[in-house]
């Protein structure tokens, strides 16, 4: 017997070091938000073990002091979903002593009414203000830079409207260094981990995103006030551009934010002379009035692969030589606000000939060719690697136009336990239908049963493998019947067996002494039930007549059958 | 002392949806599973279904699958029922009712109850 | 799912008379239980795991059976027993509950 898997808390996370009694569950958050609740539970010993305490959760606070800050985030209530109304909440940075903090605006989304966040130069409500949203209308690229050790922010919301709100990014940075650097959607390599003066860092962008603004690399420089000699850089998703990679990613502008209005851009993508290319549209979610057009060739006189308006789901499109054309025009009248409207198209050389385009390998997963070159007719078979499910179909044959028979797979993590069945003689209460890692499923056994096994099975995750329930479902058992109570002799006769209790189903036999006879039943059972019963009453010995005495011997002891087993309880 | 306070009565158009609760008192709500019952104008009595408030899990009498919704809100000690796609069958009175142990198979309380009227 | 069928369906006593009701299971149960509801109001739980009595239920009420067969007795009517009366189950899962018998002051 064990505790169920302890539920991991949305935005954090949670290890076990066992789930039987004396183990221990420790959860945490991710950066900016805090526990609320126990950090650490125990499991405690019971016919059924169970926590000491409730799961904890993880929320983003309305405001906190935070000592001994090094590096770490700060989100709004309900970051990245909207913040309520009518907030009021301050946050207290502090840095360890003789250090500075720096801040860096990671997003700053306010309702456009009396929403304002302020940041002050100080740890109270009276300290200076270096931000105030109010004032400003631009976020300062540069970010901002406490004198002393503290940073109070304020963040204050009114009763009518809502945004994403606020992610703001603090490192403390010692005497004689540079704070750590940030840049969102991208990343960076340094010469020494503490940036001290002298230090360099590099800077580049996930894919489809561009450097824009401030250098590739900065350097930490003046040992009496040190600062990085440039900007950190911004990487955005950018309309238009020429692009010579092999593979790579085209983004709908400022993704994952929404595109604006009224925009024309064109992207050029061109690979290798012999070489064409398979464009993946992964996701196209754009307004009735934007329009995406793909053309087969390097400028917009070129055939049209492919017009779009709206959303669609994946798909796949093949040019036929090594350059293709992308065009976006938005909509200049209405634009779809939200966030991750617009679209990701990963593009990818592939040979062109009288074979079918080469097959990507696919993350977590690997590819099988029926045979070495992809001429018609060969079949290529993806699997996953142990952990993973292949979504689409796995089995892809080269056709006679040269084409996939189907779209490229993928392999997704397996997030969910299978159905752990109905179990007999109870019921079950399910808390997700299709079982995702953290769901219950708690089976109860109708009155007249015993539950054998545990009664709530959580589905959990493993570093290796498919997620497994915590336990195998259980069993409702009958529950034991109670016997019946032993019927004593009758007058002039025996009884066998001759015990005190007769387990439910046991049969007892009667027969009378030489010169008597049985009147009722010879053998009785004790009938399995809430309580257990004779199945009729005892019977009595009646004298014979003298007569009768002689020619019936033979029946002074009652045949009877052999006494049963008693019921099988697992039925 | 257990109370089940249930919402107040419904008259509702045919194919809306209608939302009613059940504030529990006087115990520790999520301790016990909240079960709902109707009972129709013949006065027959039928389960619909149970919710565990600790875990959020969910069990219906098949006939009820895809009509009852159950859920909780565990801060106020709330147990909601959702009936949907409502027609004139759905007319009835609905109980929330309580087991008296956890182990128990009769319900022990029981709210007031919640009058839905289904009429064009 | 299991079917109770209670007899009669209406019945009416007059006080100091015996009064038993019966309930017939689809199939064999462990346990029934019994509920009492008067017009206007919820059912009470009145007599459980077949012959239980919760506190405030007069010692006159008393329950028996087992198998498909179950009865509730009231030894002496009263004209406060006048209600309706529902047996219910939970050998298998639905719970179902008898149509009920209304027992009336003659």
């Known amino acids: 017997l064990s505790c169920h898997f302890p539920r991991r808390p949305a935005y954090g996370d949670v290890t076990v070091t066992s789930l039987h009694p004396g183990g221990s569950a420790r959860f945490h958050c991710a950066t900016g938000y805090q526990l609320k609740g126990a950090r650490h539970l125990t499991c405690l010993n019971a016919t059924q073990p169970f926590w000491d305490s409730k799961e904890p959760v993880c929320i983003a606070a309305c405001g906190g002091v935070i000592r001994n800050a090094t590096t770490g985030r700060i989100v709004s209530p309900g970051f990245p979903g909207n913040y309520s109304n009518n907030l009021t909440c301050h946050w207290l940075l502090e840095a360890p002593e003789g250090q500075r903090l720096h801040l860096h605006f990671e997003k700053v989304s306010l309702a456009e009414d009396d929403d304002r966040l302020i940041i002050r130069n100080g740890d109270n409500v009276e300290a200076p203000p270096v931000y105030d949203s109010y004032e400003v209308e631009y976020l300062p690229i540069e970010g901002l830079l406490s004198s002393g050790k503290h940073f109070f922010v304020e963040l204050s919301t009114d009763s009518s409207g809502a945004a994403a709100g606020m992610a703001l990014r603090y490192e403390a940075f010692q005497q004689g260094h540079c704070y750590e650097p940030f840049v969102k959607y991208g990343n960076f390599s340094s010469s020494t981990p503490t940036y001290p003066v002298g230090t360099t860092v590099e800077f580049s962008c996930d894919p489809g995103y561009t450097l824009e603004q401030g250098s590739i690399i900065i350097e930490c420089v003046d040992p009496h006030d040190p600062q990085w000699n440039e900007t950190e850089p911004a990487c955005r998703a950018v309309c238009s551009g020429e692009i010579t990679d092999s593979a790579g990613v085209v983004l709908s502008p400022n993704w994952p934010e929404p595109y604006g209005r009224g925009q024309d851009c064109i992207w050029g993508v061109h690979v290798e002379e012999d070489k064409r290319i398979m464009l993946d549209i992964r996701v196209l979610r754009i307004g009735p009035g934007d329009v995406l057009t793909f053309y087969d060739g390097d400028d917009l006189t070129a055939r049209v692969l492919g017009q779009y308006s709206g959303p669609r789901s994946h798909f796949k499109l093949f040019t036929s030589m090594a350059d293709v054309t992308i065009q976006f025009q938005s909509d200049p009248g209405t634009s779809v606000l939200g966030y991750q409207q617009g679209f990701v198209i990963h593009f990818f050389e592939v040979p062109r000939n009288d074979t079918c385009p080469e097959l990507p390998e696919i993350p977590n997963g690997w590819k099988s060719p029926s045979q070495p070159e992809l001429v018609h007719g060969t079949v290529v078979t993806y699997q996953c690697y142990p952990g993973y499910q292949v979504v689409g179909s796995s089995v892809l044959m080269c056709q006679w136009d040269l084409t996939w028979s189907e779209d490229l797979p993928s392999c997704q993590r397996v997030t969910s336990c299978h159905d752990p069945g109905d179990v007999e003689h109870s019921r079950r209460l399910i808390s997700s239908p299709k079982f995702p890692v953290g769901a219950t499923v708690q089976y109860i056994c109708d009155q007249g049963f015993v539950l054998m096994g545990s009664s709530i099975l959580t589905c959990h995750d493993r570093q290796a493998g498919s997620p497994k329930w915590s336990d195998r479902a259980p069993k409702c058992l009958l529950e034991q019947l109670k016997p019946c109570h032993g019927l004593s002799a009758p007058e002039n006769g025996a009884r066998s067996p001759e015990k005190q209790l007769h387990p439910a189903g046991a049969t007892i036999h009667f027969s009378c002494a030489p010169g008597y006879v049985l009147k009722g039943q010879a053998s009785i059972k004790c009938v399995p039930g809430h309580p257990s019963h004779w199945s009729d009453p005892p019977p009595i010995c009646r004298a014979a007549s003298l007569d009768g005495f002689y020619n019936s011997r033979s029946l002074d002891v009652a045949k009877a059958p052999a006494a049963s087993s008693t019921l099988d309880a697992a039925h | 002392e257990v109370q089940l306070q249930q919402s107040g009565p419904e008259v509702m158009k045919p194919g809306a949806s209608v939302k009613m609760s059940c504030k529990a008192s006087?115990?520790?709500?999520?301790?016990?599973?909240m079960h709902w019952v109707k009972q129709n104008q013949g006065k027959s009595l039928e389960w619909i279904g149970e919710i565990n408030p600790n875990i959020g899990g969910t069990g219906y009498n098949q006939k009820f699958k895809g009509k009852a919704t159950l859920t909780v809100h565990k801060s106020s000690s709330t147990a909601y029922m959702e009936l949907r796609s409502l027609t004139s069958e759905d007319s009835a009175v609905y109980y929330c009712?309580?087991?008296?142990?956890?182990?128990?198979?009769?319900?022990?309380?029981w709210g007031q109850g919640t009058l839905v009227t289904v009429s064009a | 799912q299991i079917v109770l069928t209670q007899s009669p369906a209406i019945m009416s006593a007059s006080p100091g008379e015996k009064v038993t009701m019966t309930c017939s299971a689809s199939?064999?149960?462990?346990?029934m239980h019994w509920y009492q509801q008067k017009s206007g109001t919820s059912p009470k739980r009145w007599i459980y795991d077949t012959s239980k009595l919760p506190s405030g239920v007069p010692a006159r009420f008393s329950g028996s059976g087992s198998g498909t067969s179950y009865s509730l007795t009231i030894s002496s009517m009263e004209a406060e027993d006048a209600a309706t009366y529902y047996c219910q189950q939970w050998s298998s899962t639905p719970p179902t509950f008898g149509a009920g018998t209304k027992l009336e002051l003659k």
């Open positions: 199939s064999s149960v462990s346990y």
């Open positions: 006087g115990y520790t709500f999520t301790d016990y599973n």
């Open positions: 009712a309580r087991t008296y142990s956890y182990y128990s198979y009769e319900f022990a309380y």
